[in-house]
């Protein structure tokens, strides 16, 4: 399954929207920095592109879940958030089309359950951090920057796999 070119454009638009969502400077939130332990090796490295698809799908689904909470709606600009949801939704559709075709399911041992669990735990650590920090503006800014970093890493790894094939 070849993801459409629009998928790459969508990834770039998602990153642009995340950048535009910034409300305060990360430098004013240095004391709130946190290592969430992003499992970046699970998005590329020794995998074939097909094997990363369920993992990338999980990543985008978790981003969608994280930013579609009541607390998130209160933290970010509503117009940008709506555009962000639309981009994520389209990317989920692209990836689901690939999964339905059987790539990443029939050829993937254990459906990469270990990688998917690692991604879920990563997002739960983020959720717990926000809760502990009482969803403060600095906590949300740390999370926004973290999601930009991890999303960029995961999509870059996907792109490098695509170019190798």
């Amino acid at each position: 399954c070849d993801l459409p070119q629009t998928h790459s454009l969508g990834s770039r638009r998602t990153l642009m929207l995340l950048a535009q969502m910034r409300r305060i400077s990360l430098f004013s939130c240095l004391k709130d920095r946190h290592d969430f332990g992003f499992p970046q090796e699970e998005f590329g490295n020794q995998f074939q592109k097909a094997e990363t698809i369920p993992v990338l799908h999980e990543m985008i689904q978790q981003i969608f879940n994280l930013f579609s909470t009541k607390d998130s709606s209160a933290a970010w600009d509503e117009t940008l958030l709506d555009k962000f949801y639309t981009e994520l939704y389209q990317q989920l559709n692209d990836l689901e089309a690939c999964v339905i075709q059987g790539v990443g399911v029939t050829e993937t041992p254990l459906m990469k359950e270990d990688s998917i669990l690692a991604v879920r735990k990563y997002f739960q650590r983020i959720t717990l951090y926000l809760k502990e920090k009482k969803y403060s503006p600095c906590a949300w800014e740390v999370v926004r920057a973290e999601i930009m970093r991890s999303f960029s890493l995961s999509t870059n790894l996907q792109e490098s796999l695509r170019s190798k094939e």
Partner: antibody, heavy 119, light 111 residues
């Protein structure tokens, strides 16, 4: 029949680095999460860490800095960076087929390899 | 660091009887169900009995039953057999994998 076996255990002096190796039979290591667990003589089990199918490594708190887990296409290695007498134990390599239920659900275990750290 | 406390540390059971082993975590395991139970006999590696708190591993007799959620878990062995004499361990998986750990173990003696 799918199995794992550890090797490399021996008597070492404190501070001498030692690498244990886990070899798989009947399956590809690249497709599974593989962990290391140890057991001191007459004591309980201790979770050291795990390497996921993609290569991400997690260590338990006390093991960080003391051990390094790495994976190649044919082996999973556990390097003891600077062993002390407290690291004397049988070291087990294990695989989980149930990673959705956590990284402690190991269902295929090797027989273990004994490491003795003594001066 | 998380602590998994197993009680009792040793228990005696008659053949045909029932044994219950408790495993208490100082914090909820991941997803409230990421807890496994193992059986270990002297000189052998551990054997997985239960994963996901209550799912029986392949080839394990239905006499073994896992229950519980969150922080409190129980392994129950009914119709105890001589072959069940062993040490049993619980193992917890947490949202932060640096906290993954085994319980201290429970020795089951069969009379």
């Amino acid at each position: 029949c799918q199995s794992v076996e550890e090797s490399g255990g021996r008597l070492v002096t404190p501070g001498t680095p030692l690498t244990l190796t886990c070899i798989a039979s009947g399956f590809s290591l690249s497709s599974y999460a593989m962990g290391w667990v140890r057991q001191a003589p007459g004591k309980g089990l201790e979770w050291i860490g795990i390497v996921l199918s993609g290569g991400t490594v997690y260590y338990t708190n006390w093991a960080k800095g003391r051990f390094t887990i790495s994976k190649t296409s044919s082996t999973v290695d556990l390097k003891m960076t600077s062993p002390t007498t407290e690291d004397t134990a049988t070291y087990f390599c294990a695989r989980t087929d149930y990673p959705a239920y956590g990284f402690t659900s190991f269902n295929i275990w090797g027989p273990g390899t004994l490491v003795t750290v003594s001066s | 660091a998380q602590v998994l406390t197993q009680t009792p540390s040793s228990v005696s059971a008659a053949v045909g009887g029932t044994v219950s082993i408790s495993c208490q975590s100082s914090k909820s395991v991941y997803n409230n169900n990421c807890l496994s139970w193992f059986q270990q006999k002297p000189g052998q590696p551990p054997k997985l009995l239960i994963y996901g708190a209550s799912t029986l591993a392949s080839g394990v007799p239905s006499r073994f039953k896992g229950s519980g959620s969150g922080t409190q878990f129980t392994l129950t062995i009914s119709d105890v057999q001589c072959d069940d004499a062993a040490t049993y361990y619980c193992a917890g998986d947490y949202v932060d994998d640096m906290e993954n750990t085994f319980g201290g173990g429970t020795e089951v003696v069969v009379k």
